[in-house]
Amino acid sequence: DSSKWVFEHPETLYAWEGACVWIPCTYRALDGDLESFILFHNPEYNKNTSKFDGTRLYESTKDGKVPSEQKRVQFLGDKNKNCTLSIHPVHLNDSGQLGLRMESKTEKWMERIHLNVSERPFPPHIQLPPEIQESQEVTLTCLLNFSCYGYPIQLQWLLEGVPMRQAAVTSTSLTIKSVFTRSELKFSPQWSHHGKIVTCQLQDADGKFLSNDTVQLNVKHTPKLEIKVTPSDAIVREGDSVTMTCEVSSSNPEYTTVSWLKDGTSLKKQNTFTLNLREVTKDQSGKYCCQVSNDVGPGRSEEVFLQVQYAPEPSTVQILHSPAVEGSQVEFLCMSLANPLPTNYTWYHNGKEMQGRTEEKVHIPKILPWHAGTYSCVAENILGTGQRGPGAELDVQYPPKKVTTVIQNPMPIREGDTVTLSCNYNSSNPSVTRYEWKPHGAWEEPSLGVLKIQNVGWDNTTIACAACNSWCSWASPVALNVQYAPRDVRVRKIKPLSEIHSGNSVSLQCDFSSSHPKEVQFFWEKNGRLLGKESQLNFDSISPEDAGSYSCWVNNSIGQTASKAWTLEVLYAPRRLRVSMSPGDQVMEGKSATLTCESDANPPVSHYTWFDWNNQSLPYHSQKLRLEPVKVQHSGAYWCQGTNSVGKGRSPLSTLTVYYSPETIGRR
């Protein structure tokens, strides 16, 4: 049953004289193992004998014997799966049909394989992509329908006969599906590769040439251009002529259009390979190139920078920066279109030439107010001198200058006056917009820069003002010099340091804290009576009668000021003691008699002592001695003694007469 035999192998194998063939092969015999195998060359079936006739290249039998001449052909298979064969070397006359005659116990099969052996190594085949574009990576493939384990080969790539630098990847296939050797080369062709010959060379293991295939590269690319200009340096003067020519070195496919560009913009009606510029103007300076297009895209030449030279144009001045702050640095830049660039500059300030300034830039490291004004310049190159442009204005800003505080009042100023001050300045940029005053007070500003102080205080010593724009400038403080009557007049005891005792030497000082003007007069007064005109009031020996309320007055040309009343207290021992009797010095017995010890003392008497006519002290110590009821025996002379912290004083004797009552007389 033939359906039981299934074979897989390449349909045809290719080789050349002296090489080898390796025939990958698999089979399946479903009824058991292979018992006999014969490899025929060009087998033909003989109907008479019911057998195949042909050259037997290989034969294996049950006993496994193989004739010795069969070493060239090897059966590398087995009894149930593998039918791989090798012929080494292979000869030209091996070409034709190989027949694998397989026999199992019950079945037979003839499998045919084509073998194509050439006289010389056949060439590989180069495969190219359908289109190749410059700079786009492509894969070149070199394919050879040959591979054999016993005959190593290599494929090498050449460009115009020179080995290519790019690394190729070689792969081989020896499978039942296909037998080949393949080399793949990744390559980014440039436009210059167009028309060049690429070769894939088949070599043996020693690098000996066997065969090759060649292709001509057709690299699609945009037109490649060259540009030429007359004059060659592309530097001309206004009115000269310029010619530019564009040459196409290569284009694939054919170019279709040509145009010229200036600074990237297409020039109208310029569609030939020559650009003629007659009587050029400075506006025609710029970067020129030609552009030629084909189906791949536009190609551009290198740029030619055409310089049309001309004398400087009227100049303008750029100021970095205006307005400028006084003290800052400022740079002036003279800007003038010219070709070639100006080599010399003349600078003007307010129309007057600035000496020694010949550069494009003028740098002023420290700007002052007088630097303000109009700056202009003139540029000069080899073709001539430009005109002076309108110039630029430098505005120098600074704080207000020479600020002064001015008192508007007639002098002198007296305490309580209304004072008007003004804040003046010499110059300011920008204008003064506000004023400040020191010290701050609840004062009126009736108009800008004027200060009114109502009821000026004696202690308003100095005032300063500031005029402000973007900055504030302070004036030196001005002294108001307010005149006022003496202040804080008071009486001060200089001596004695302790309390005043009668008989002491006493000095009182009339003090004041301040006075303006300084020239003063003093007045001392006691109970409305003028005592002296010096600053001190002196008592050589003070007496109790000097005690009392004292005031001093200090006056200057503005006015006079009195001190608070000051009480002068004189301490003295009790004096002028006398004993007074109530109801009188004659009292009837049985009645009541009160003796009072009267005295003058400072401080008051703190302790009294009573004495009788015998100078006997009585056991009474209060100011009053009360005798009740009075007896005749009480009659006699009494005196008292008063004591205070200063000393003692005694009274003269005072006689008390106690007479008998009518009752006593009646009893007698």
């Epitope: 028309g195 020519t245 040459e247 054919e254 170019y255 030939t272 390979f273």
Partner: nanobody
Framework: QLQLVESGGGLVQAGGSLRLSCVGS????????MGWFRQAPGKEREFVAA????????TYSDSVKGRFTISRDNAKNTVYLQMNSLKRDDTAVYVC??????????????????WGQGTQVTVSS
């Protein structure tokens, strides 16, 4: 379609001169690289001379260098070949052709897309 018509050929004695003209129809002639080729009986076509559109690039074959001069007038869409010191070997049909592939391919006939019919030049001894 570009059409080219040659004129100026004829019979001339060796050492003599001829001036060939090639007129193109349409403006595209002015942007084409123009070449002259010749073909003698029984011989392959041979490159003679080529001129770029601007006239800035000119190429001659070694066999005519110093004797022939190629020029062009783009305003007239015309290319000229001034042939001096003619030799018997110069006998051939002279054909003008237009190329839009650039001067690197000026001597490669296969890169010329448009061809004239040719004009016969015969140099006698």
């Amino acid at each position: 379609q570009l059409q080219l018509v040659e004129s100026g050929g004829g019979l001339v004695q060796a050492g003599g001169s001829l001036r060939l003209s090639c007129v193109g129809s349409g403006d595209r002639v002015s942007i084409a690289l123009m070449g002259w080729f010749r073909q003698a009986p029984g011989k392959e076509r041979e490159f003679v001379a080529a001129i770029s559109p601007s006239g800035g690039r000119i190429t001659y074959s070694d066999s005519v260098k110093g004797r022939f001069t190629i020029s062009r007038d783009n305003a007239k869409n015309t290319v000229y070949l001034q042939m001096n010191s003619l030799k018997r070997d110069d006998t051939a049909v002279y054909v003008c052709a237009a190329n839009f592939r650039g001067y690197l391919s000026s001597s490669r006939g296969s890169d010329y897309a448009y061809w004239g019919q040719g004009t016969q030049v015969t140099v006698s001894s």
